[in-house]
């Protein structure tokens, strides 16, 4: 066990495993989507660059009452080194562009698959 900030935290999950699990969850969301995801909620689009995990969570954290993305939000928190608050915005947000959660998930999935293929796990 590693001691971090007063907690005995679980042993670290290998980044490749964590990324693969996140990809699998996003695939699951896109494949099982029947009604509009999160009732068609809109979120800020983000630049898919370094720091995108926190930015993605900053966007998704403002979606309320959507059980379909709870697991994704949890997984993203594992990639983001700081606690994200609702209403928080990073420089990675495309502030003039809002997209549906479904499209946000698809865009994120495509980019994460690319990162996985290239071996960029962090």
């Amino acid at each position: 066990l590693t001691c971090l900030g007063g907690f005995a935290s679980p042993g670290p999950v290998p980044p490749s495993t964590a990324l693969r699990e996140l990809i699998e969850e996003l695939v699951n969301i896109t494949q099982n989507q029947k009604a509009p995801l999160c009732n068609g909620s809109m979120v800020w689009s983000i630049n898919l660059t370094a720091g995108m995990y926190c930015a993605a969570l900053e966007s998704l954290i403002n979606v309320s009452g959507c059980s379909a993305i709870e697991k994704t939000q949890r997984m993203l928190s594992g990639f983001c080194p700081h606690k994200v608050s609702a209403g928080q915005f990073s420089s990675l947000h495309v502030r003039d562009t809002k997209i549906e959660v479904a499209q946000f998930v698809k865009d994120l999935l495509l980019h994460l698959k690319k990162l996985f293929r290239e071996g960029q796990f962090n």
Epitope: C3, L4, G5, G6, F7, S9, P10, P12, V13, A18, I61, S64, G65, C66, S67, A68, I69, E70, K71, Q73, R74, M75, L76, S77, G78, F79, C80, P81, H82, K83
Partner: nanobody, 127 residues
Framework: QLVESGGGVVQPGGSLRLSCAAP????????IAWFRQSPGKEREWVSC????????IYSDSVKGRFTISRDNAKNTLYLQMNSLRAEDTAVYYC??????????????????????WGQGTQVTVSS
């Protein structure tokens, strides 16, 4: 803000069900986590359940033995603990951050912290 109950003394192999209630707010609106702390050790994350109950996660040390659940009508969260071992002896705490999702266990202590805690309930596993 949170109130735990259901602790006690139990023999190895026995069972207990812990409860977590919140008199001042609606537990059903938030993800809730359980932690535990043994004497002389750091507080350890045990389990978490998301608001909908669709995402439940467990530490390796309790997986297959403990079950987290919620009854939103009663505004109560439960931790069913089976096949208890001496090493499960600890004070058990429930916590929330008034978010709908659980925090990834690997993020705990790295800035991802829960802000609302109970006072804890003692669980002792001894023959």
């Amino acid at each position: 803000q949170l109130v735990e109950s259901g602790g006690g003394v139990v023999q190895p192999g026995g069972s207990l069900r812990l409860s977590c209630a919140a008199p001042r707010f609606t537990l059903g609106s938030y993800a809730i986590a359980w932690f535990r702390q043994s004497p002389g050790k750091e507080r350890e994350w045990v389990s978490c359940i998301s608001r909908s109950g669709g995402d439940t996660i467990y530490s390796d040390s309790v997986k297959g033995r403990f079950t987290i659940s919620r009854d939103n009508a009663k505004n109560t969260l439960y931790l069913q603990m089976n096949s208890l071992r001496a090493e499960d002896t600890a004070v058990y705490y429930c916590a929330t951050d008034k978010r709908s999702f659980c925090y990834a266990p690997e993020g705990l202590g790295k800035g991802w912290t829960y802000d609302y805690w109970g006072q804890g309930t003692q669980v002792t596993v001894s023959s």
